[in-house]
């Protein structure tokens, strides 16, 4: 997987005035990074794995970037036309990727009132739009702005792709966070569902990166995907992820029933608990 | 005694139809996921279709996905398998057979049957 | 799908020899894993799950070991009546056979 920083800003307008305050928010490697509030920007990081990405540092430069960007946006949807009365918003998603092979990828994508409009490969210079007239009448809207505004030329571009290459690579030196692997804590629970039956699930957290194989098996067999229920694969606010699988078993046949989970070449088999024990937690080295 | 016994084999055109059963007896069937696994002549092991214990998981290999169904009976005790627009290739003797509900199972199966011969052939 | 490949497809040992038999899954199966023996005419007998877990009632002469890719079942020390066909089987990904080997008397 390639390591990736992201940048999502969002400006609002209320009745055709833009709002003064934006919101950013930065993910680094698919986990929340760093975030600026509404009325004022100040970079915070998103728990201590991103405190820990360059130490005691002053979020200052981050801070100033951020902001800058976040008025480069605000003026772009003041020249959004087909403002109608009530709440509006635009939203700005710059992602950069550093692959394996230490080829990169950049591009910028404009999403107006959470629908996507306009995207930009950052390298090519490409320009990319949905077939719809909407999308297209926004499109033509803001390309035209930012042909016009001087700030926003082919040398903006390069150097935002520049720009978060650079800082993308500044925060993978620190290699605290990034290319780590930690284990999932796996542990399963019961509860009584309808008569005869009950739900075993299977919680997985605490896991980096986020790749994991959940499942349920019966005698070692997986249960087909329509006899389990999953949940997403979500951050948990500490730089790592959780997840869960659940069925539906009779109650009696506990034994015959275990979790498999595998994450980054480890694997480990979790068995329900009996009755009595609601919980059990076994942690694989 | 624990036992499978398969039935319903024989020789049959290509393009027909055939319906094999297994009946169980020596141990309570409906605790158990059941196979269908057959063996051409002369030749290894193919697994052919999975049922679980109560029916809600059912598997089958890609050379009979869409024209063979598996289902079972808990209540007669049998495991069946409809065979649809049957092939040349698909002349086996075909067995059922239980899977394993020892603790730490990895999907084995323990009791098989003695067989039942699929001729087809025009 | 996961494919079972197992060698030697047959080999010629004489009573008393150690016997080794490979099986080799197309990608990761952990350690789902079985083995069986069969003779002609008859129908397969369980032997081995979870790679190396001895069915009750197989001689200790029977062993498996392995995880992941690569599998062995061996025969300490053959007899008369182990000359037979022995496949390996996954359950990882559905569930599929090796091709068999087939161990014959020199």
């Known amino acids: 997987e390639p390591h990736s920083l992201r940048y999502n800003l969002t400006v609002l307008s209320w009745d055709g005035s833009v709002q003064s305050g934006f919101l950013t928010e930065v993910h680094l490697d698919g986990q929340p990074f760093l975030r600026c509030d509404r009325q004022k920007c100040r970079a915070k990081p998103q728990g201590q794995w991103a405190e820990d990405v360059l130490g005691n540092k002053t979020w200052d430069r981050e801070t100033r970037d951020l902001t800058g960007n976040g008025k480069d946006l605000r003026m772009t949807l003041a020249h959004i036309k087909d403002q109608k009365e009530g709440l509006h918003s635009l939203q700005e998603i710059r992602v950069c990727e550093i692959h394996e092979d230490n080829s990169t990828r950049s591009s910028q994508h404009f999403y107006y009132d959470g629908e996507l409009f306009l995207s930009q490969n950052l390298e090519t210079k490409e320009w990319t739009m949905p077939q719809s007239s909407r999308a297209q009448t926004l499109a033509m809207n803001v390309r035209n702005f930012l042909k016009e505004d001087a700030m926003k030329t082919k040398t903006h571009y390069h150097a935002m792709h520049a720009d978060c290459l650079q800082e993308l690579r500044r925060y993978l030196k620190s290699g605290v966070v990034l290319r780590r692997t930690v284990p999932p804590m796996v542990n399963v629970t019961r509860s009584e569902a309808s008569e005869g039956n009950i739900t075993v699930t299977c919680r997985a957290s605490g896991f980096y990166p986020w790749n994991i194989t959940l499942s349920w098996r019966q005698d070692g067999v997986s249960l087909s995907h329509d006899t389990q229920q999953w949940g997403d694969v979500l951050p948990d606010g500490n730089g790592t992820y959780q997840t869960w699988v659940a069925t539906r078993i009779c109650q009696g046949e506990e034994q015959r029933f275990t979790c498999y989970m595998e994450h980054s070449g480890n694997h480990s088999t979790h068995p329900v608990p009996s009755g009595k024990v609601l919980v059990l937690q076994s942690h694989w080295q | 005694e624990v036992q499978l016994v398969e039935s319903g084999g024989g020789l049959v055109q290509p393009g027909g139809s055939l319906r094999l059963s297994c009946a169980a007896s020596?141990?309570?069937?409906?605790?158990?996921?059941m196979n269908w696994v057959r063996q051409a002549p002369g030749k290894g092991l193919e697994w052919v279709s999975y049922?679980?214990?109560?029916?809600?998981?059912?598997y089958y290999a890609d050379s009979v996905k869409g024209r063979f169904t598996i289902s079972r009976d808990n209540a007669k005790n049998s495991l069946y398998l409809q065979m649809n627009s049957l092939r040349d290739e698909d002349t086996a003797v075909y067995y059922c057979?239980?899977?394993?509900?020892?603790?730490?199972?990895?999907?084995?199966?323990?009791?098989w049957g003695q067989g039942t011969m699929v001729t087809v052939s025009s | 799908d996961i494919q079972m490949t197992q060698s030697p497809s047959s080999l010629s040992a004489s009573v008393g020899d150690r016997v080794t038999i490979t099986c080799r899954a197309s990608?990761?199966?952990?350690?789902?894993l079985n083995w069986y023996q069969q003779k002609p005419g008859k129908a397969p007998k369980f032997l081995i799950y979870?790679?190396?877990s001895l069915q009750s009632g197989v001689p200790s002469r029977f062993s498996g070991s392995g995880s992941g890719t690569d599998f062995t079942l061996t025969i300490s020390s053959l007899q008369p009546e182990d000359f037979a066909t022995y496949y390996c089987?996954?359950?990882?990904?559905?569930?599929?056979f090796g091709g068999g080997t087939k161990v014959e008397i020199k």
């Open positions: 057979a239980r899977v394993s509900v020892i603790t730490g199972n990895t999907g084995a199966f323990d009791i």
């Open positions: 020596g141990f309570t069937f409906s605790r158990y996921s």
């Open positions: 049922i679980s214990s109560s029916s809600s998981t059912i």
């Open positions: 990608q990761s199966i952990s350690s789902y």
């Open positions: 979870a790679a190396s």
């Open positions: 089987q996954q359950s990882y990904s559905i569930l599929t």
